[in-house]
C-alpha cells in the first residue's frame, strides 16, 4: 500500500523542484577513517583532493576498504551498532581501511527530507571513490559499501554514480518507505555493485514496513521470514530494559540485520546458512533445505558471491542473540490412516537425540494441515549442535493445552462422533540436515507398533544413511 509520506508519497527531489528553488546543496558529508577499534578515538577525516590525510592516517591503498553508511537518525548522533560494526571489521580484517560516512546533518531530518538527501550523499561517496581511483594501487574491486536502512540506498546511489563498479554492497535491512517498488536507479539494486547481498529483518505485509520487502540484491536473505525476530517481542524488550515500547521492538528487529552481520564477522567458526526458497511459507514447511546448484549460502560477511540471472530469495532461522546460528532439519513423515478420520490436526512434538547432545522438545509446525496417506514435510531447528542423530521421539500432544486445541478436538469429534480412537500410523521418519546436507532414515523402534494417538509417543532409531530403503521403488502410497 502507498507509504504515508509526502504529497502522494512522492519525493520533492531536485528533478521536481521548481527551478527557482533549486540550489547547489553543500553536502554535509564527512569521511571518517577509523584507525582504532576504540569508539572514543576520533580517527582521521579524509578530504576530497587532499592526499596528506591519506598518508598521515595510514590509508592502505592495496587493502580492502569498507565504507559504513548509517541511515535516518532521530538522535543526530552515532548509535551503538556503528561502533560494534567498526570494531568487528577491524577484528576480522586487520589491514583494512574502515571509513564511516558521516551524513548525520542530512539524516537528522524529517524522514522525507532524509530520503531526498540520499542521492546527494551517494554522489559524494562516488566522488570520493572516483578520486581514490586516481591513486596508484587503489581498486574499486576491494571496496565494500555497508549500508544500514536508508544507508543501504545511499550505497546504491554511490555504486550507481561511481565511475566503474564497486566490489560489493551489503544492504542491512534497506529502508522500505518511499523505496518499495521504486525505479531500479532510485533504490539499491543488483546493478549497483559486482555483488549485492541484502539482509531483511523488518518487513511487514500489513502496516508500515520499515524495511523493504522486495528483493533488491543478487541474494536477499530473510532471517526468520524477514519479519518477527526472536528476542524482539514486546515481552523480550520489556524484560531487558526498564521500559519497553513498540519503538524498541521496531529498533530491535530493524537493527537485527546489523547484529547478524557483526555475528558473521566475529563468529566465523559458527556461520549461519540460508537456503533458497520461493517464499517464507515453503521454507517453514521444510521444503527448501538444499545446497545443490548454489541453493544455500553463508549469511553476512561470509556470503559467497552469486550473480544469478534472477534474484535469489533465501531464508533461515536464527537464535535470539549472538551467536545466531541454528541447525536446520527437514523431517519427512509419511502418515498413514487406517480409518477415515476426517479432518485431523494433531499437535506433534519431536525430541532429537544425537552423539553430542539432545534437543529440547520441538514443535512440528503445521503450516497448512496434515495430509493423510501422504508424506508431510516439516522444518525443525535446534540451537545446539547435536552431532550425528541417533534417535527421535515423536509425541502427539494429549490433553488440550489451549482453548484453540480444545476447539480442534471438539470440531474433530463433531465431524466423526463414532470414531473416538483417533490414530495415525508412522513407520519411519526421513531427516535431512541443512548444515551438513546429510540424509538419514529413522525406523520405528518396534516395527509391530507404528500407531500413535493423542497423549502417546513413538520412538524411531536410525536405520539407514540416506533415504532410499532396500527394495524400495519410486515413492508410492504404502498401505498395509
Amino acid at each position: 500500500s502507498p507509504t504515508p509520506f509526502g504529497p502522494e508519497g512522492q519525493l520533492e527531489d531536485e528533478l521536481h523542484k521548481p527551478k527557482a528553488i533549486q540550489t547547489e546543496v553543500k553536502p554535509s558529508v564527512r569521511f571518517n577513517l577509523r584507525t582504532s577499534k576504540d569508539p572514543e578515538h576520533e580517527g582521521c577525516y579524509l578530504s576530497l583532493g587532499h592526499s596528506q590525510p591519506l598518508e598521515d592516517c595510514g590509508f592502505n591503498m592495496t587493502a580492502k576498504t569498507f565504507f559504513i553508511i548509517h541511515g535516518w537518525t532521530m538522535s543526530g548522533i552515532f548509535e551503538n551498532w556503528l561502533h560494534k560494526l567498526v570494531s568487528a571489521l577491524h577484528t576480522r580484517e586487520k589491514d583494512a581501511n574502515v571509513v564511516v560516512v558521516d551524513w548525520l546533518p542530512l539524516a537528522h531530518q524529517l524522514y522525507t527530507d532524509a530520503v531526498n538527501n540520499t542521492r546527494v550523499v551517494g554522489h559524494s561517496i562516488a566522488r570520493m571513490l572516483d578520486w581514490l581511483q586516481e591513486k596508484d594501487d587503489f581498486s574499486l574491486e576491494n571496496v565494500h559499501l555497508i549500508g544500514y536502512s536508508l544507508g543501504a540506498h545511499v550505497a546504491g546511489y554511490a555504486g550507481n554514480f561511481v565511475k566503474g563498479t564497486v566490489g560489493r554492497i551489503t544492504g542491512l535491512d534497506p529502508a522500505g518507505p518511499m523505496f518499495e517498488g521504486a525505479d531500479i536507479h532510485k533504490r539499491l539494486s543488483p546493478d549497483d555493485a559486482d555483488f549485492v547481498d541484502v539482509l531483511h529483518t523488518y518487513t511487514r505485509s500489513f502496516g508500515l514496513s520499515i524495511g523493504i520487502q522486495m528483493p533488491v540484491g543478487h541474494i536477499d536473505i530473510y532471517p526468520n521470514g524477514g519479519d518477527f525476530q526472536p528476542g524482539c517481542g514486546l515481552n523480550d524488550v520489556l524484560g531487558s530494559m526498564a521500559y519497553g515500547t513498540i519503538t524498541e521492538v521496531v529498533k530491535c528487529e530493524h537493527e537485527r540485520a546489523v547484529h547478524l552481520f557483526v555475528d558473521s564477522l566475529v563468529n566465523q567458526d559458527k556461520p549461519s546458512f540460508a537456503f533458497q526458497c520461493t517464499d517464507s511459507n515453503r521454507f517453514k514447511k521444510g521444503i527448501c533445505l538444499s545446497c545443490r546448484k548454489n541453493r544455500c549460502n553463508s549469511i553476512g560477511y561470509n556470503a559467497k558471491k552469486m550473480r544469478n540471472k534472477r534474484n535469489s530469495k533465501m531464508y533461515l532461522k536464527t537464535r535470539a542473540g549472538m551467536p545466531f546460528r541454528v541447525y536446520h532439519y527437514q523431517m519427512k513423515i509419511h502418515v498413514f490412516s487406517y480409518k477415515n478420520m476426517g479432518e485431523i490436526e494433531p499437535t506433534f512434538y519431536v525430541t532429537l537425540y544425537g552423539t553430542n547432545a539432545d534437543s529440547q522438545t520441538l514443535p512440528l509446525e503445521i503450516v497448512e494441515r496434515i495430509e493423510q496417506n501422504a508424506t508431510n514435510t516439516f522444518l525443525v531447528y535446534t540451537e545446539e549442535d547435536l552431532g550425528d542423530l541417533l534417535k527421535i521421539q515423536l509425541t502427539w500432544e494429549g490433553a488440550s493445552q489451549s482453548w484453540y486445541n480444545l476447539w480442534k478436538e471438539l470440531r474433530s469429534y463433531l465431524s466423526q462422533p463414532h470414531n473416538p480412537g483417533r490414530e495415525l500410523n508412522i513407520r519411519r521418519i526421513r531427516v535431512k540436515s541443512g548444515e551438513t546436507q546429510r540424509k538419514l532414515t529413522f525406523c520405528a523402534e518396534d516395527p509391530e507398533n507404528t500407531s500413535i494417538s493423542p497423549g502417546r509417543e513413538l520412538w524411531f532409531r536410525k536405520c539407514r544413511d540416506g533415504w532410499r530403503m532396500k527394495n524400495e521403488t519410486s515413492p508410492t502410497v504404502e498401505l498395509p
Epitope: 500500500s1 502507498p2 512522492q10 527531489d13 531536485e14 528533478l15 521536481h16 527551478k19 533549486q22 542521492r119 554522489h123 562516488a126 550507481n160 554514480f161 561511481v162 565511475k163 566503474g164 518499495e180 517498488g181 521504486a182 525505479d183 531500479i184 536507479h185 532510485k186 539494486s189 543488483p190 546493478d191 520487502q213 522486495m214 528483493p215 534472477r310
Partner: antibody
C-alpha cells in the same frame, strides 16, 4: 523546468547509421539516467537502453547490442544515440526520456525513416 | 527478460465511464510498475509509478493498484481528454519492458 530537446527528423538508407541528439536542461544533467525508447509506426514502445551522463555508464537492450551506442557531452548537457546497420524495421520515432520515478520527462521525439 | 502483457488491446467507452486496464508480468515485479499515457503524435506522459503513486499533476481520477504479477490502471470517470493509448512498464529490472498498449477510444 526540465526540458529535453531532440534533433530533427532523419532519412537514411539501409546499412547506414543515424545519430540522434537530446539536449537536457533544468536539472543536474550528470546524476539522472537518460533512456532511449523507440516507437515504430502504429506500434508500442520499446526500450533501447540508457546512459548515466556523469559516469557514462550504459545499459543496453540485448536486441540492439552491437548496433546501438549511447554517449554524452557533459559540456553541452547532451546525450546521443547512434544506431548502425539500419534496416527498414528501424523506421520509428525515437524518444529520449529522463528517469527518476519512471520516465518522468520525455523529449518531443525524432522521426527516423529508413528507406532505399 | 520480463514480459508485460496488457489487456485489452483496445476498448470503447463513453465520457463518465469507469475504465480498467490490466497488465500481467511474466514474473514477480513486486510493485515496480509505471503507467504512461500517450496521445497521437505526442510523447508519452508518466501517470503512475511504483504501481499506485500518482505522478505530479496527474488528476485523481487515475489510480493504480496491484503487486507481484497483476496490475491495474483505473480511470474512475473518463474525461474527453483521456482518450489515448496507455502503456504499463516494469521498472524492477533491466531491461525495462513495456506492455503492448491499450487504446481507449470513444464509443
Amino acid at each position: 523546468q526540465v526540458q529535453l530537446v531532440q534533433s530533427g527528423a532523419e532519412v537514411k538508407k539501409p546499412g547506414a547509421s543515424v545519430k540522434v541528439s537530446c539536449k537536457a536542461s533544468g536539472y543536474t544533467f550528470t546524476t539522472y539516467w537518460i533512456a532511449w525508447v523507440r516507437q515504430a509506426p502504429g506500434q508500442g514502445l520499446e526500450w533501447m537502453g540508457e546512459i548515466l551522463p556523469g559516469s557514462a555508464k550504459t545499459k543496453y537492450n540485448k536486441k540492439f547490442k552491437g548496433r546501438v551506442t549511447m554517449t554524452r557531452d557533459t559540456s553541452t548537457s547532451t546525450v546521443y544515440m547512434e544506431l548502425s546497420s539500419l534496416r527498414s524495421e528501424d523506421t520509428a520515432v525515437y524518444y529520449c526520456a529522463v528517469y527518476d520515478y519512471g520516465a518522468d520527462y520525455w523529449g518531443q521525439g525524432t522521426t527516423v525513416t529508413v528507406s532505399s | 527478460d520480463i514480459q508485460m502483457t496488457q489487456s485489452p488491446s483496445s476498448l470503447s467507452a463513453s465520457v463518465g465511464d469507469r475504465v480498467t486496464i490490466t497488465c500481467k508480468a511474466s514474473q514477480d515485479v513486486y510493485t515496480a510498475v509505471a503507467w504512461y499515457q500517450q496521445k497521437p503524435g505526442k510523447s508519452p506522459k508518466l501517470l503512475i509509478y511504483s504501481a499506485s503513486y500518482r505522478f505530479t499533476g496527474v488528476p485523481s481520477r487515475f489510480s493504480g493498484s496491484g503487486s507481484g504479477t497483476d496490475f491495474t490502471l483505473t480511470i474512475s470517470s473518463l474525461q474527453p481528454e483521456d482518450f489515448a493509448t496507455y502503456y504499463c512498464q516494469q521498472h524492477y529490472s533491466i531491461p525495462r519492458t513495456f506492455g503492448g498498449g491499450t487504446k481507449v477510444e470513444i464509443k
